[in-house]
Interface confidence: low
Amino acid sequence: MMTGTIETTGNISAEKGGSIILQCHLSSTTAQVTQVNWEQQDQLLAICNADLGWHISPSFKDRVAPGPGLGLTLQSLTVNDTGEYFCIYHTYPDGTYTGRIFLEVLESSVAEHGARFQIP
């Protein structure tokens, strides 16, 4: 039975040109995390494998940094980075847990005024 839950940073906004940390945390389970995948829609951004370490997809190498922890840092943000991001935790014996984060990248002036994107 899957007892765990994924806590995420939820819906977040950031400035164009800036950086943001995507964080997920798996709690309420003693399952062993064997691998975490970070995906944007259907694109693989990065993998953190318990035995092999980090892999960043070649197309994101310049703008994505591993960590902190099992999180992911996105740099040099563009408006095109707006969208859904998923952390996929592969665990034993529970199976797969998925967390969702929505990022909106705003023009600098808008972000400065504290505008936030909300999903109803």
């Epitope: 062993q32 691998q35 993998i47 494998n49 370490g53 592969h90 665990t91 034993y92």
Partner: antibody
Framework: QVQLVQSGAEVKKPGSSVKVSCKAS????????ISWVRQAPGQGLEWMGS????????NYAQKFQGRVTITADESTSTAYMELSSLRSEDTAVYYC??????????????????WGQGTLVTVSS | DIVMTQSPLSLPVTPGEPASISCRSS???????????LDWYLQKPGQSPQLLIY???NRASGVPDRFSGSGSGTDFTLKISRVEAEDVGVYYC?????????FGGGTKVEIK
């Protein structure tokens, strides 16, 4: 259906090098471990090393360290095994084999399936 | 390095009868993720090896259900419930728990 096709037989002189290729078709090349295993005539199987193209770095058996280089070209889905300073004891059939093909919780050199058809390398003066 | 010891070295079998091969490792093959990193391969005469069982007890795709793998830690067994003529060849166990990956010496199965 994943298939591995290896390059043809080679005859080499002692002290020279050989480079065997292994072309993968089907499945996800980047996230699959490609391993090299050799079998001397009438003998058992011996692991030489493995690479996961996704992670780039290869692991080698201590016995072959410094003599073997395993690389992968993701543009052609081809892995290579180069063995240098050849001696007669290196006469063997060299197999490439593939690990789990998907980026799921178990990733690595966990099992080998499928295997290439094998490449006979004969070292003789 | 982890040493893999197979027995017997040779196994003459009668078609229709069961057969069993043992494989022992010098260290535990149980990973913290709960899986035993132990595989079984069959190399038929003149062919490349083929995967039979992975992670201790999982039958590979297309492998007949007369083959089964069991065991945990350091002791593993491959069983063939009813041997068929096409099962002849050399059977190898392999550990993938630690680098370097190592194979057992092989068990040659032949028809009596």
């Amino acid at each position: 259906q994943v298939q591995l096709v290896q390059s043809g037989a080679e005859v080499k002189k002692p002290g020279s090098s050989v480079k065997v290729s292994c072309k993968a078709s089907g499945g996800t090349f980047l996230s699959s471990a490609i391993s090299w295993v050799r079998q001397a005539p009438g003998q058992g199987l011996e692991w030489m090393g493995s690479i996961i193209p996704l992670f780039g770095k290869a692991n080698y058996a201590q016995k072959f360290q410094g003599r073997v280089t395993i690389t992968a070209d993701e543009s052609t889905s081809t892995a290579y095994m180069e063995l240098s300073s050849l001696r007669s004891e290196d006469t063997a059939v060299y197999y490439c084999a593939r690990g789990p093909s998907e980026v799921k919780g178990i990733l690595g050199y966990v099992w080998f399936d499928p295997w290439g058809q094998g490449t006979l390398v004969t070292v003789s003066s | 390095d982890i040493v893999m010891t197979q027995s017997p070295l040779s196994l003459p079998v009668t078609p229709g009868e069961p057969a069993s091969i043992s494989c022992r490792s010098s260290q535990s093959l149980l990973h913290s993720n709960g899986y035993n990193y132990l595989d079984w391969y069959l190399q038929k005469p003149g062919q490349s090896p083929q995967l039979l069982i992975y992670l201790g007890s999982n039958r590979a795709s297309g492998v007949p259900d007369r083959f089964s793998g069991s065991g945990s830690g350091t002791d593993f067994t491959l069983k063939i419930s009813r041997v068929e003529a096409e099962d002849v060849g050399v059977y190898y166990c392999m550990q993938a728990r630690r680098i370097p990956i190592t194979f057992g010496g092989g068990t040659k199965v032949e028809i009596k």
